[in-house]
């Protein structure tokens, strides 16, 4: 059993069919020493007599919020959650496994640029009755400070008969030193409680491996005299680090026309411009990525070829 | 939401077997653990049964323990609860529960409840 903040504590359990569960002696926070009894959340039955009393937490019935009283005088409280292991792996049933890019991928994190600030996000089919908390750091055994606020519900969409909830944070590195070869990762640590389940979730990454930029900006078509072609500009994300010299990116331009069908013209290019073919209905696109180390290209930006 | 429907109660002999189901429509019935309790006239809801959501782990009261046997189909959205052995004191309504914390015999720890089955073992 582990204190997980004021008067909550965690019980590891081991859980299997006829398990003996886990033994845990509860002490009142009280310097009165007789006439102490003890009740389970809201119900008046007695559960046992004493500054300290000794339970079986066999399973979630024996959770809950253990109260001890004296006269009808509340003393403390303490609220028992659960950490259920079964078959040797801890419970991961609150947050939704999100497949990619693999599987048990419950947490994943983005960064725009190299400035040390990241966002994390999860999925859950619960709606209810819980609450999320999230530490971060680099490194563990001697870790660096990382910054997180409070994750919030960032979305909300139907999938079947579900509806799935998207929860994101925002943490941002104390010292970050965006220029630095990273060797030590980022460790994010979420702990989730669903009613009385507590479960933890963790992330290891290194920034450059999070890296997607946002898509370039202020994209715009010249069409050249006399032809077909158009030269296509934009300008780098105002998120992305700078000076773009030494952090510098990539681009992909292509041209796609109505249908999904037709073939896609694609051309690469390090600088902020290119001339392509400009077809009827056709639209042109441009998406970016760091120029040096191939984490995440950017999503889309577009413009109609008309 | 979530909504259930027991069926398949009725009245048999000490000894002999009954298949009660649970058929569940609403949300996702594979995000929710299930239980059976059961309820006697002048008496608080007893704990009989619950099976996580995947169907791997399940959970039971001594006093049917080896006599009843929880399942679920998650393709159709149904629980089952085979009866072995009947005795007159297992007679009782039976009732099907959705929850979120598995395991637990507790009755305030299931969200969503059935109307139940009757169920009468006769000697």
């Known amino acids: 059993i582990w204190e997980l903040k004021k008067d909550v504590y965690v019980v590891e359990l081991d859980w299997y069919p006829d398990a003996p569960g886990e033994m845990v002696v509860l002490t009142c926070d009280t310097p009165e020493e007789d006439g102490i009894t003890w009740t389970l959340d809201q119900s008046s039955e007695v559960l046992g007599s004493g500054k300290t009393l000794t339970i079986q937490v066999k399973e979630f019935g024996d959770a809950g919020q253990y109260t001890c009283h004296k006269g009808g005088e509340v003393l403390s409280h303490s609220l028992l959650l659960l950490h259920k292991k079964e078959d040797g792996i801890w419970s991961t049933d609150i947050l939704k496994d999100q497949k990619e890019p693999k599987n048990k991928t419950f947490l994943r994190c983005e960064a725009k640029n190299y400035s040390g600030r990241f966002t994390c996000w999860w999925l859950t089919t619960i709606s209810t009755d819980l609450t999320f908390s999230v530490k971060s750091s680099r490194g563990s055994s001697d870790p660096q400070g990382v910054t997180c606020g409070a994750a919030t519900l960032s979305a909300e969409r139907v999938r079947g008969d579900n509806k799935e909830y998207e929860y994101s944070v925002e943490c941002q590195e104390d010292s970050a030193c965006p220029a630095a070869e990273e060797s030590l990762p980022i460790e994010v640590m979420v702990d989730a409680v669903h009613k009385l389940k507590y479960e933890n979730y963790t992330s290891s990454f290194f920034i450059r491996d999070i890296i997607k930029p946002d898509p370039p900006k202020n994209l715009q078509l010249k069409p050249l005299k006399n032809s077909r072609q158009v030269e296509v500009s934009w300008e780098y994300p105002d998120t992305w680090s700078t000076p773009h010299s030494y952090f510098s990116l990539t681009f992909c331009v292509q041209v796609q026309g109505k249908s999904k069908r037709e073939k896609k013209d694609r051309v690469f290019t390090d600088k902020t411009s290119a001339t392509v073919i400009c077809r009827k209905n056709a639209s042109i696109s441009v998406r970016a990525q760091d120029r040096y180390y191939s984490s995440s290209w950017s999503e889309w930006a577009s413009v109609p070829c008309s | 939401e979530v909504q259930l429907v027991e069926s398949g109660g009725g009245v048999v002999q000490a000894g002999e077997s009954l298949r009660l189901s649970c058929a569940a429509s609403g949300r996702s019935f594979s995000n929710y653990e299930m239980g059976w309790f059961r309820q006697a006239p002048g008496t608080e809801r007893e704990f009989v049964s619950t099976i996580s959501r995947r169907g791997s782990s399940t959970y039971y009261a001594d006093s049917v323990k080896g006599r009843f046997t929880i399942s679920r189909d998650n393709a159709k959205n149904t629980v089952y609860l085979q009866m072995s052995s009947l005795k007159p004191e297992d007679t009782a309504v039976y009732y099907c529960?959705?929850?979120?914390?598995?395991?637990?015999?507790?009755?305030?720890?299931?969200?969503?409840w059935g109307q139940g089955t009757q169920v009468t073992v006769s000697s």
């Open positions: 529960a959705a929850g979120q914390l598995f395991p637990s015999s507790r009755p305030r720890d299931y969200d969503y």
